[in-house]
Every structure is written in structure tokens, then in C-alpha cells.
Amino acid sequence: LQDLCSNCPAGTFCDNNRSQICSPCPPNSFSSAGGQRTCDICRQCKGVFKTRKECSSTSNAECDCISGYHCLGAECSMCEQDCKQGQELTKKGCKDCCFGTFNDQKRGICRPWTNCSLDGKSVLVNGTKERDVVCGPSPADLSPGASSATPPAPAREPGHSPQ
């Protein structure tokens, strides 16, 4: 009997109620592999999800997030609200980054500007809510005979919190 079921192709299921005949998956269901005893219910892309690929008898529907949201998780299992650059998402909605912090993405959280002085450098370009500061050479680096060594990675004060 098991052999009979293994002959059922994708898009069908092995129907125990009908002497293990291969029956097509009912509407809104699918089987992506052969030999299945049931068909799986198709995923529905609703609410903050939109359909990227319709369900067929052999493959599940695929969802994306609607405009203004981004996908998280395997196969876009979650949608999280976008914010603008220079903002972060809180429970009360999108909030501007606090002074001294920035976010260059439409998702995620604000993080502190680089502290150029920790590397003995000066601020070449000021930071904004959307962009980190740009560190430039310290006055000593510009003096004659100064070393042209590769600068270390940018430093930030540890434990700095955005709010």
C-alpha cells in the first residue's frame, strides 16, 4: 500500500478514503513533493503582506511586505514598518534620532556618531540624523614631517545610548 502512495506526484495526495488513489489537491492547497497523504493549505498574503507568487497545486504562495514595510524572517514571515533615514521605530511610531545619533537605513535603530577625538582626530564633516561624522586628520597630522600611518578604525564611546 505504501508503494501505491509513493507513486502520487506533487500536486496530488494519497487518498485513504478512495483506496489510496492519487487525488488532486483541493483548491487553495498544494503538495510540493510526491507521496503525500495530505495537501498543505496555501499561505494567504493579507494585511501587511502582498502576493509575490500565487499558490499552485505544487508550490506554496510567496509573500512580500506592502510598501512602507520590510521583510523579516524566512520566506518573509514577518513585516516590520519602515521609517525614514534619520529615524528609528518605536512603539509610538517613527521617532527622529536624538542629537548625536544617526541612522542611514529605513529600518533599524539610531547609533552614536563616531567620536573622532578618541582616535586623536578632528571632525572633518559634522554628523546629521542620517549620516555619521567624517573624521579628518588631527592638526598634528597636518604638520610637516607627520607620519602617514594608516588610521585605526573609528572609535565611539562605549555604552553610549541614543535616548
Epitope: K91, G108, R111, P112, T114, D132, R156, P158, S161
Partner: antibody, heavy 116, light 109 residues
Framework: QVQLVQSGAEVKKPGESLKISCKGS????????ISWVRQMPGKGLEWMGK????????NYSPSFQGQVTISADKSISTAYLQWSSLKASDTAMYYC?????????WGQGTLVTVSS | DIELTQPPSVSVAPGQTARISCSGD??????AHWYQQKPGQAPVVVIY???NRPSGIPERFSGSNSGNTATLTISGTQAEDEADYYC???????????FGGGTKLTVLG
């Protein structure tokens, strides 16, 4: 598809140093936070800290500040957790996870055993 | 930092409703997330942002969050729901994530 693959189990002696890794693939590694989570044997989840690989900005739980160092090398899409001097109480499963609030992808975990 | 407190264990008969609480000062001001962890496996999100259910998570899982308590509710609990459950929140004050201590859900019988 998105994956976080962690380095293998480690057995160490107290006082030794250790660096474990978490390699991301299938997404823009530089622009998503990576968090580290500890689970001691038979105990719950503890958030240790996080790193933004794009610029290596780190932020630690007060409980783990100064105890461990989190780093990343975006050129090879890998985050690290390291100890300079292990203690027996560091014996635990360590997970990396993508995100800072919602952890949508997790590594398989690295079991660290510290015993003399 | 905020501390999240969960009951160590909850028992429920199959088909009944299980409720797992997560209490913390004004947790309702922040998003709460819930993770399920089965033995030998990494955690999996079952509820995010208080009440949203990822696709692939059964409809019997739901969540709420207000005041000082977030709650995970499993209606018509099944044997496969037996696992450890953890609440978590991200706090903008400390720029940190906090997990609750975890609740072991036992499905009787």
C-alpha cells in the same frame, strides 16, 4: 537563503582565551545588527550585546560589559565573541542572532565548555 | 534596565487554553516579542510586536501587551506546543534587549 553558521564546540581550561564566530550569508551582512545570546545549561536566554557590522559599533548588556568582546569583520561577513580569560561559569551555549529587538534568524549555537 | 518576570512553569490539558505572563515595569510602553524553544534547538519567534504572528505559526498563538504585563495565549493547546517560552523587549533607555526568565509549558497527558 539567509543563514548564520557558527563555529564548532570548544573545550577550554579556566584562564584560557577563546574567540568564536558567526558567519552570515544570503543578506547584506553590514546593514543588520548581530546579537549574541548566552544560555547556561538548563537555564534561560540572556542577551549579551550587539554589533552593527557596517561600522563595528557595539553595545553591551551591563551584565556582560567588560567580560567579553564583540567584534566583526564585514569583509568576510563574520561576527565574533571573545574572552581573554575564561571561567568555569562561562560554560554555556552561545547563539548569534540577527537583529536587535526581533531576532529573526539564529545560528545553530556554539557549546563552550570550561573545565579544569 | 527593565526586568521581565515569567512563571517558571505552566501546565495545561490538551485542547485547553494556556496563558503565559511576562511582567515588567511599563512593558506596555515597549514592544514585547515571544520565542519558543524546544530541546536542542535555537529559539523561534512565535509572536512579534505584542500581537503579530509570523506566517507558519499556527493561529492558536496570540499575544497582548499593556500596562505592566505582556501575555502569550495558546488556544487549543497541542502536544507539539510543549516547549520553553521566552518574552523579550528592546528598551530605548538602555539601548539593550532583555529576556524574561522563561516558562516551561507542559501539555498534560
Amino acid at each position: 537563503q539567509v543563514q548564520l553558521v557558527q563555529s564548532g564546540a570548544e573545550v577550554k581550561k579556566p584562564g584560557e582565551s577563546l574567540k568564536i564566530s558567526c558567519k552570515g550569508s544570503g543578506y547584506s551582512f553590514s546593514t543588520y545588527w548581530i546579537s549574541w545570546v548566552r544560555q547556561m545549561p538548563g537555564k534561560g536566554l540572556e542577551w549579551m550585546g550587539k554589533i552593527y557590522p557596517g561600522d563595528s559599533y557595539t553595545n553591551y548588556s551591563p551584565s556582560f560589559q567588560g567580560q567579553v568582546t564583540i567584534s566583526a569583520d564585514k569583509s568576510i561577513s563574520t561576527a565574533y565573541l571573545q574572552w581573554s580569560s575564561l571561567k568555569a561559569s562561562d560554560t554555556a551555549m552561545y547563539y548569534c542572532a540577527r537583529g536587535y529587538g526581533i531576532f529573526d534568524y539564529w545560528g545553530q549555537g556554539t557549546l563552550v565548555t570550561v573545565s579544569s | 534596565d527593565i526586568e521581565l518576570t515569567q512563571p517558571p512553569s505552566v501546565s495545561v490539558a490538551p485542547g485547553q487554553t494556556a496563558r503565559i505572563s511576562c511582567s515588567g515595569d511599563n512593558i506596555g510602553d515597549q514592544y514585547a516579542h515571544w520565542y519558543q524553544q524546544k530541546p536542542g534547538q535555537a529559539p523561534v519567534v512565535v509572536i512579534y510586536q505584542d500581537k503579530n504572528r509570523p506566517s507558519g505559526i499556527p493561529e492558536r498563538f496570540s499575544g497582548s501587551n499593556s500596562g505592566n504585563t505582556a501575555t502569550l495565549t495558546i488556544s487549543g493547546t497541542q502536544a507539539e506546543d510543549e516547549a520553553d517560552y521566552y518574552c523579550s523587549t528592546y528598551t530605548f533607555v538602555g539601548f539593550t534587549t532583555v529576556f524574561g526568565g522563561g516558562t516551561k509549558l507542559t501539555v498534560l497527558g
